[in-house]
Interface confidence: low
């Protein structure tokens, strides 16, 4: 992507770099994960060390709303974040080294779209450049995966089991075990983002307890084993 808006390009006796920006056409990631939007650039101001601003915007170039902005003081390699949409955007690259790569945390399906990087030199070499075609972020749904399953002490010398899974759409969780009615006793709550947690509040018998997570893309299961006659509960997945 070597197109953008070009202002006041300096002339040099030696051949100078032109403004250009390099971004991939597309980045794919699963909902709930993080993605990196790569962006590097070249510019004609060979030894520019003045103030600069790095910007990412969404939707459309030049006019789309900003999702990230940081500013570096003259001579500084630290780009101080001034805007990070809901705190989910973080600069990975070093703008002083021509790298504006951005990390997006906790992806949602709604994050799908086109993103545009931009750099502004605001010192003597007053200039700016922006990717015109941008990078397309495709956020895809995610099959379930169980991220934690455990047995914990409960009230009155009883035990309880917890199962946390993630996926998009958020998976439905179900417990099964040696005691009748265990699955119906599971308490399911909505967690953060794409994680859901189900609790089996009272494990009444020793044996294997299985947590199953399912959504439209698939299913996952994991088990814990309760052996109270061994003292502490043992777990296995």
């Amino acid at each position: 992507d070597a197109s953008g808006d070009l202002l006041n390009t300096e002339a040099h006796s030696a051949p100078a770099q032109r403004w250009s920006m390099q971004v991939p056409a597309e980045v794919n990631a699963e909902a709930g994960d993080a993605a990196v939007l790569p962006c590097t650039f070249t510019h004609p101001h060979r030894h520019y060390d003045g103030p600069l601003t790095a910007i990412w915007r969404s939707g459309e170039p030049y006019a789309g709303p900003q999702v990230f902005r940081c500013t570096a003081a003259p001579g500084s390699e630290l780009c101080q974040t001034a805007l990070s949409l809901h705190g989910r955007f973080r600069l990975l690259g070093n703008p002083r080294r021509n790298d504006l790569s951005l990390r997006v945390e906790r992806l949602a399906l709604a994050d799908s779209g086109r993103y545009f990087c931009r750099v502004e030199f605001t010192g003597d070499a007053h200039d700016r450049y922006e990717s015109r075609h941008g990078v397309r972020l495709r956020v895809t749904a995610a099959a379930p995966r169980i991220v934690n399953i455990s047995v914990l002490p409960g009230p009155a010398h009883a035990f309880r089991a917890l199962c946390t899974a993630e996926g998009e759409p958020p998976p439905a969780l179900a417990w099964s075990g040696p005691a009748p009615g265990n699955s119906s006793a599971a308490l399911q709550g909505q967690g953060h983002g794409y994680q859901v947690t189900a609790e089996l509040p009272a494990l009444t018998r020793d044996g294997r307890y299985t947590c199953t997570a399912a959504n439209s893309l698939g299913r996952a299961e994991a088990s814990v084993y309760l052996f109270r006659f061994h003292g502490a509960p043992g777990t296995s997945t």
Partner: antibody, heavy 122, light 107 residues
Framework: EVQLLESGGGLVQPGGSLRLSCAAS????????MSWVRQAPGKGLEWVST????????YYADSVKGRFTISRDNSKNTLYLQMNSLRAEDTAVYYC???????????????WGQGTMVTVSS | DIQMTQSPSSVSASVGDRVTITCRAS??????LAWYQQKPGKAPKLLIY???SLQSGVPSRFSGSGSGTDFTLTISSLQPEDFATYYC?????????FGQGTKLEIK
């Protein structure tokens, strides 16, 4: 002063047309997505349409798709809603609203106009 | 479309009371939820965005919480000017949708 000012409402017969305008001031208009939201008498809020800051992307509620057109003139700091084939159920106060400044697809509305009444009746 | 359901539809309370309004989405909307206050004959006013961020200029007695499908707006100590109708709105996906509103009335 940061504000939005709607105009163009009025009484129109079913099947008729109206063009609403929303004049913006006090902020960089072209940097923000803008929307129309309506409220029928005694009812709740209903999102109608959104347009991106540069005008390249537009979105509509199913109830108005094909009949309403959102547009903007960034040189005049003005948002428009062209309403054709109006129906009795389009009767409402129409508000223009500014996106808070996050992504166009994930925004709250932090600035609203005072609203303009559209009545569709024979 | 994502349906937003508010409860209660109306609530009576007194100045100084703590009031909680809930909003439930028909599917996971992460934290893409806003709360608005509207008084009769006036435009809505943004109170909370991204589920829990307080809009500039809004008193700190207003707070929002929740993520996924269940959200809460809390007014810690009601003031006379807080009696109004409150709406939640999801901005996870287009079409944006609002709750049906909760009318907060003086007891």
């Amino acid at each position: 002063e940061v504000q939005l000012l709607e105009s163009g409402g009025g009484l129109v017969q079913p099947g008729g047309s109206l063009r609403l305008s929303c004049a913006a001031s006090g902020f960089t208009f072209s940097s923000y997505a803008m929307s129309w939201v309506r409220q029928a008498p005694g009812k709740g809020l209903e999102w109608v349409s959104t347009i991106s800051g540069g005008g390249g992307s537009t979105y509509y509620a199913d109830s108005v798709k094909g009949r309403f057109t959102i547009s903007r003139d960034n040189s005049k700091n003005t948002l428009y809603l062209q309403m054709n084939s109006l129906r009795a159920e389009d009767t409402a106060v129409y508000y223009c609203a500014k996106a808070i400044g996050s992504s166009w697809y994930s925004d709250a509305f932090d600035l609203w106009g005072q609203g303009t009444m559209v009545t569709v009746s024979s | 479309d994502i349906q937003m359901t508010q409860s209660p539809s109306s609530v009576s309370a007194s100045v100084g009371d703590r009031v909680t309004i809930t909003c439930r989405a028909s599917q996971d909307i992460s934290s893409w939820l806003a709360w608005y206050q509207q008084k009769p004959g006036k435009a809505p006013k943004l109170l909370i965005y991204v589920a829990s961020s307080l809009q500039s200029g809004v008193p700190s007695r207003f707070s929002g919480s929740g993520s996924g499908t269940d959200f809460t707006l809390t007014i810690s100590s009601l003031q006379p000017e807080d009696f109004a109708t409150y709406y939640c709105q999801q901005s996870y996906s287009i079409p944006y949708t609002f709750g049906q509103g909760t009318k907060l009335e003086i007891k």
